[in-house]
Amino acid sequence: SEVEYRAEVGQNAYLPCFYTPAAPGNLVPVCWGKGACPVFECGNVVLRTDERDVNYWTSRYWLNGDFRKGDVSLTIENVTLADSGIYCCRIQIPGIMNDEKFNLKLVIKPAKVTPAPTRQRDFTAAFPRMLTTRGHGPAETQTLGSLPDINLTQISTLANELRDSRLANDLRDSGATIRIG
């Protein structure tokens, strides 16, 4: 059965996938596709790497990590409910029946609606939740800045989001690693 990952509408989704190159820069082709892994390749390919670089990608799909070190985890930007489903990460390791195939289930939840008094600023504007990106797009930091007047619900929401952020990092750090060579 597939490992399940969750994200909210409007957020970025993170689907972990790793391998350990036999030597630095000794990469193997990897593909990501929407749908369970078939016999070869990936169905409905959304991103693909070769032995050197990312050679195919579609909008909203990118590799946030250092794929040259084997972090081929997929980030899906600004997800919608339509992004729910199974995704395939396939690591195309040379040799007889060596491919590593991972089916990851992405569950998209509707965005939480937090009612706030009209005099208060929008929560997401007060707390810009930005992922630190590597390699693609501008480098952004997660920051609180100056605190406006906020209610307990908002503080609770922020705490949950910080916890979820740590959980995502834990998942990233403890993801299954495939050693090649």
């Epitope: 193997v28 078939p38 016999v39 070869f40 390749e41 050679n55 040379p94 040799g95």
Partner: antibody, heavy 120, light 107 residues
Framework: QVQLQQSGPGLVKPSHTLSLTCTVS??????????WSWTRQHPGMGLEWIGY???????YYTPSLKSRLTISVDTSKNQFSLKLSSVTAADTAVYYC????????????WGQGTLVTVSS | EIVLTQSPATLSLSPGERATLSCRAS??????LAWYQQKPGQAPRLLIY???NRATGIPARFSGSGSGTDFTLTISSLEPEDFAVYYC?????????FGGGTKVEIK
């Protein structure tokens, strides 16, 4: 456009090794994006997938033939080959080489087919 | 391994008629199903991949549908060159397997 030309003997003795070669023209066998495969068809019967080797070196063999099968690529000659050892009369078939476009699987190319008869 | 059952075994039709061929899988293959056409003495030719996508150069009269375990190949109006044997093939699970074929013959 990729073209595939098969070569190899049409008659093989029982217990010997069947060897077929597929020469690729119109493209480089080492360039990304293709799976190089073999399929066979017993006389008057349906199709049976034998196995493939990918542009990245991934190799898959059908389980029933795995212990006797070798599929390999010779990039210097732009060829890929099939070797099936310890053949019996049950291996008599038309053997096809084929290439499948991995970029969406929307086209494939086939060799002309080689009838291989296993007989003493 | 996944078994593909094609029906009917033989379909007798006249040029201009509509042909409907069925392929049923012993377990779900999602949408990873292809259709091939084979004429006597020739290699197979890919018609449809991923259940419903026409391969390069295939005429619009060929269409595929279905997902999971039940699939259909439809030829909207048979041309003389369409009389051949048609095979379905699943690409979901290793080993890849083909159906037994449906022969479309001239009535």
């Amino acid at each position: 456009q990729v073209q595939l030309q098969q070569s190899g003997p049409g008659l093989v003795k029982p217990s010997h090794t069947l060897s077929l070669t597929c020469t690729v023209s119109g493209g480089s066998i080492s360039s990304g994006g293709y799976y190089w495969s073999w399929t066979r068809q017993h006389p008057g019967m349906g199709l049976e997938w034998i196995g493939y080797i990918s542009y990245s070196g991934s190799i898959y063999y059908t389980p029933s033939l795995k212990s006797r099968l070798t599929i390999s690529v010779d990039t210097s000659k732009n060829q890929f080959s099939l070797k099936l050892s310890s053949v019996t009369a049950a291996d008599t078939a038309v053997y096809y080489c084929a290439s499948l476009d991995s970029w969406g699987s929307n086209r494939d190319y086939w060799g002309q087919g080689t009838l291989v008869t296993v007989s003493s | 391994e996944i078994v593909l059952t094609q029906s009917p075994a033989t379909l007798s039709l006249s040029p201009g008629e509509r042909a409907t061929l069925s392929c049923r899988a012993s377990q779900s293959v999602s949408s990873y199903l292809a259709w091939y056409q084979q004429k006597p003495g020739q290699a197979p030719r890919l018609l449809i991949y991923d259940a419903s996508n026409r391969a390069t150069g295939i005429p619009a009269r060929f269409s595929g549908s279905g997902s999971g375990t039940d699939f259909t190949l439809t030829i909207s109006s048979l041309e003389p060159e369409d009389f051949a044997v048609y095979y379905c093939q699943q690409r979901s699970n290793w080993p890849l397997t083909f159906g037994g074929g449906t022969k479309v013959e001239i009535k």
